[in-house]
Amino acid sequence: EINGSANYEMFIFHNGGVQILCKYPDIVQQFKMQLLKGGQILCDLTKTKGSGNTVSIKSLKFCHSQLSNNSVSFFLYNLDHSHANYYFCNLSIFDPPPFKVTLTGGYLHIYESQLCCQLK
């Protein structure tokens, strides 16, 4: 189920790549964030907290990612036209409860000016 389009700027272009921003509420301590391209899982990141507030970050499908206190950024490089698609942030909240899954996303448009290696 798609809960809605992102209510923020999800795609940030730089140097022939794109940063895809997936936000989560900053009270959330334990979660899984997946980046989906269409229905396919491209990347995922799971944050858990153990005893003594030890933070553990795991990725089953690794992408270059960056974690902040309210977002996960996934980075895609060497953009070409095949990257144009719907991208979704699939957030599973574990703690604090209730358990909640939300899917928000948007369409990534690829323009010539954003491509990595344009032919002159």
Partner: antibody, heavy 121, light 106 residues
Framework: QVQLVQSGAEVKKPGSSVKVSCKAS????????MHWVRQAPGQGLEWIGL????????NYNQKFQGRATMTVDKSTSTAYMELSSLRSEDTAVYYC??????????????WGQGTTVTVSS | EIVLTQSPATLSLSPGERATLSCSAS?????MHWYQQKPGQAPRLLIY???KLASGIPARFSGSGSGTDFTLTISSLEPEDFAVYYC?????????FGQGTKLEIK
């Protein structure tokens, strides 16, 4: 139905502590976190903090850090908020509120009826 | 701290009229929630995620806005709508409420 029932009114002396309880019913207690909010007479609302019943993780408003302590008793489905070193400015109605999430944010979906705490010498 | 400023402080209207309540944030927030409070009662959730109607809330209530400016609208006031309304942000720690708008009968 989902209900949060809080303990009765308290009158306390400055410098003492108060412990307010919030008993949950109508849902699985461990499936939701609990917030605490207060409202001074004629004033607005102020967020105190949150406790995860799932993990016991707490998140306090810095203003109350060190003075407020949130705990839970899973066996009785009760959340507690203790406030120490009371002063007259702590005179307020204290509310518990159940945590919930929308698509983008979190909010309090169910509230207790409130507990009046009066701090007076 | 994100300060939420509600305006007007008091709004005097008659039943059947349209009410527009504003909430302005000192810096950008991702979403806003709205609560209604009647004397001697706990607040009650009206709107979450800026525009979603909470369970059991009549459709005459609606919410809108983004960034720093948010609005709660009551399309046609009913006698039971006269109360105090608070906006709330959970985007930026510490989480804050507006000071409230009192909606009173004219």
């Amino acid at each position: 139905q989902v209900q949060l029932v809080q303990s009765g009114a308290e009158v306390k002396k400055p410098g003492s502590s108060v412990k307010v309880s919030c008993k949950a019913s109508g849902y699985t207690f461990t499936d939701y976190a609990m917030h605490w909010v207060r409202q001074a007479p004629g004033q607005g609302l102020e967020w105190i903090g949150l406790i995860s019943i799932y993990s016991d993780h707490t998140n306090y408003n810095q203003k109350f850090q060190g003075r407020a302590t949130m705990t839970v008793d899973k066996s009785t489905s009760t959340a507690y908020m203790e406030l120490s070193s009371l002063r007259s400015e702590d005179t307020a109605v204290y509310y518990c509120g159940r945590n919930n999430y929308g698509n983008y944010g979190w909010y309090f979906d169910v509230w207790g009826q409130g507990t009046t705490v009066t701090v007076s010498s | 701290e994100i300060v939420l400023t509600q305006s007007p402080a008091t709004l005097s209207l008659s039943p059947g009229e349209r009410a527009t309540l504003s909430c302005s944030a000192s810096s950008s927030v991702s979403y806003m929630h709205w609560y209604q409070q009647k004397p001697g009662q706990a607040p009650r959730l009206l709107i979450y995620d800026t525009s979603k109607l909470a369970s059991g809330i009549p459709a005459r209530f609606s919410g809108s806005g983004s960034g720093t400016d948010f609005t709660l609208t009551i399309s046609s006031l009913e006698p039971e709508d006269f109360a105090v309304y608070y906006c709330f942000q959970g985007s930026g720690y510490p989480y804050t409420f507006g000071q409230g708008t009192k909606l009173e009968i004219k």
